[in-house]
């Protein structure tokens, strides 16, 4: 029985390493050897890669090696399968090396914040040594917060031929550790490099993001004062690394700001003793860079009708800011 006609020929040019073609079927019932016929140097030269009489007979792959790999170039490839019963030839296929070139991954050597620029990381990497000089490379930068499994991606191209490259990734979360990895490919190629080794960088610290604030109303005391326990924590979405130096609390009866009282604490809970009127309570956290937005709670008057569910009540502040990612060089 004749061998099957080689089909699904796929070729890839590993830059300055080899030009490899594979095809199907990968295995034949009887011992089969293959010839891959190639024209190169824009048709001026021809050669053959063969698996005959080798341990790789029956193996549906063949590689051409330097120095006969020329770039840029167009190759013509035909695969011949041969067994004891005869030869079957594939259709002729055509390959533009620029379109099938695969290069090494770049090497990230630093991921750092830039002093004074908020929510940005500057990624610096070394262009792969084994990449064509003066060619435009396209890149995919993958990044995620260190405690997340979800990668985000940004694509860009670089025309520079300097070996050291930089990219500024903006509108990130403040004071957050990010994991970065980078891959690249010649602009015209369908094959990406592998991913670079991951590198971690941390965005600059900012004033605290905000607080989620709760209160528990306790029964009024004999003297008429009402204990109100305040509790707060970092707002959802705040940077994991964020640390507050302390918290400022101020409160006053409704419509009477003259009676404002203030408290400073380093705890995340505080008990107030309020009169029977309606009160407004405000809490901010602060660090060396400033204060968070204000978290606000209204404490109803004693005689105000409240349901049982109001005994333990939380006020979650939603900051109306958009945290979409925009990226700039």
């Amino acid at each position: 029985v004749l061998p099957a006609k080689p089909e699904n020929i796929s070729c890839i040019f590993y830059y300055e390493e080899n030009f490899t073609c594979t095809w199907s079927p990968e295995k034949e019932a009887s011992y089969t050897w293959y010839k891959v016929k190639r024209t190169y140097s824009y048709g001026y030269k021809s050669d053959i890669c063969s698996t005959d009489n080798s341990t790789r007979g029956n193996h549906a792959s063949c590689s051409f090696l330097p120095p006969t790999i020329t770039n840029p170039d167009n190759y013509t490839i035909q695969v011949e399968a041969q067994n004891a019963d005869g030869i079957m030839k594939s259709d002729i296929t055509y390959w533009n090396l620029d379109a099938i070139m695969k290069i090494e991954p770049p090497e990230i050597f630093s991921v750092k914040s830039v002093l004074g620029i908020k929510r940005m990381l500057q990624i610096k990497w070394i262009r792969p040594v084994l990449a064509p000089h003066s060619s435009t490379l396209k890149y995919t930068l993958r990044f995620r917060t260190i405690n997340s499994a979800y990668w985000m991606e940004v694509n860009f191209t670089k025309e520079d031929i300097d070996r050291d490259e930089t990219y500024n990734l903006t509108e990130l979360q403040a004071f957050t550790e990010y994991v970065m990895t980078l891959r690249c490919a010649p602009a015209e190629s369908m094959f990406w490099s592998g991913w670079s080794q991951e590198k971690v960088g941390t965005t600059e610290e900012e004033a605290p993001y905000g607080l989620d604030l709760w209160r528990v109303l306790k029964p009024a005391m004999v003297d008429g004062r009402r204990p109100v326990q305040l509790m707060w924590k970092k707002a959802t979405g705040a940077p994991v690394l964020e640390k507050a130096l302390g918290y400022n609390i101020w409160y006053f009866p409704e419509n009477n700001t003259n009676l404002t009282e203030t408290v400073n604490t380093t705890n995340q809970t505080h008990e107030l003793y309020l009169g029977g009127k309606t009160y407004w309570v405000y809490v901010v956290s602060y660090n060396s860079l400033g204060e968070s937005p204000v978290a606000t709670l209204r404490i109803p008057a004693l005689n105000e009708k409240t349901g049982l569910n109001d005994i333990f009540e939380a006020q979650k502040i939603e900051w109306h800011e958009h945290h979409h990612h925009h990226h700039h060089h």
Epitope: K37, T39, G43, Y44, K45, S46, T51, S63, Q78
Partner: antibody
Framework: EVQLVESGGDLVKPGGSLRLSCVAS????????MSWVRQAPGKGLQWVSG????????GYADAVKGRFTISRDNARNTVYLQMNSLRAEDTAVYYC????????????????????????WGQGTLVTVSS | EVVMIQTPLSLSVSPGEPASISCRAS???????LVWYLQKPGQSPQLLIY???SRATGVSDRFSGSGSGTDFTLRISRVEAEDVGVYYC?????????FGQGTKVEIK
Amino acid sequence: EVQLVESGGDLVKPGGSLRLSCVASGFTFDDYGMSWVRQAPGKGLQWVSGINWAGGTIGYADAVKGRFTISRDNARNTVYLQMNSLRAEDTAVYYCARESPLRLGDLGGDYFYYYYYIDVWGQGTLVTVSS
Amino acid sequence: EVVMIQTPLSLSVSPGEPASISCRASQSVSSRYLVWYLQKPGQSPQLLIYGTSSRATGVSDRFSGSGSGTDFTLRISRVEAEDVGVYYCQQYDNAPRTFGQGTKVEIK
């Protein structure tokens, strides 16, 4: 037996045209490249043109570029050389030659490599360009 | 184009003596693409050596080739009467393919 038989050589006036044919037998024609090589009377060999196994033109000698065209018809096992705007200096014996894949010494690795070289020549056909 | 210069242009050798022909390229040529042919009187050329040093099928081991870059050599260890003819080097590396001008070998 591998054979290449050229035909079409003739006496032609300057500026005239001629088409040379080379019929191949004894081998699988479409596996091989084909070339035309000429030899002016009492002179050395000059490569004229070639066509690879896939049907792509290998190229032309500078002296004939733009005037000569090589082609092949695999169904007829034939290679052609269309010669236009002929000049006196094109007078020569024109040889048809086969380019075969020959294995070079083991280059290492898992594979064997073959490169194409002229290994079979026809007897030649004489083209004379004269007024 | 790559110019191939052969020296000497003619050679007269006694039977049994060695002979050597040099082929110098005007620019570097890959050893894969350097070939030697012999054209015996009244015949078509025949392939002697391909890839600088590989002997074609049926070629006597008296013939050997060597060289790299721009300098290539064909050696005949012991010349015999059947070796007479014109020897040509040819390069395939750069377009267009070019031959040397030929070296005529005669028997003394």
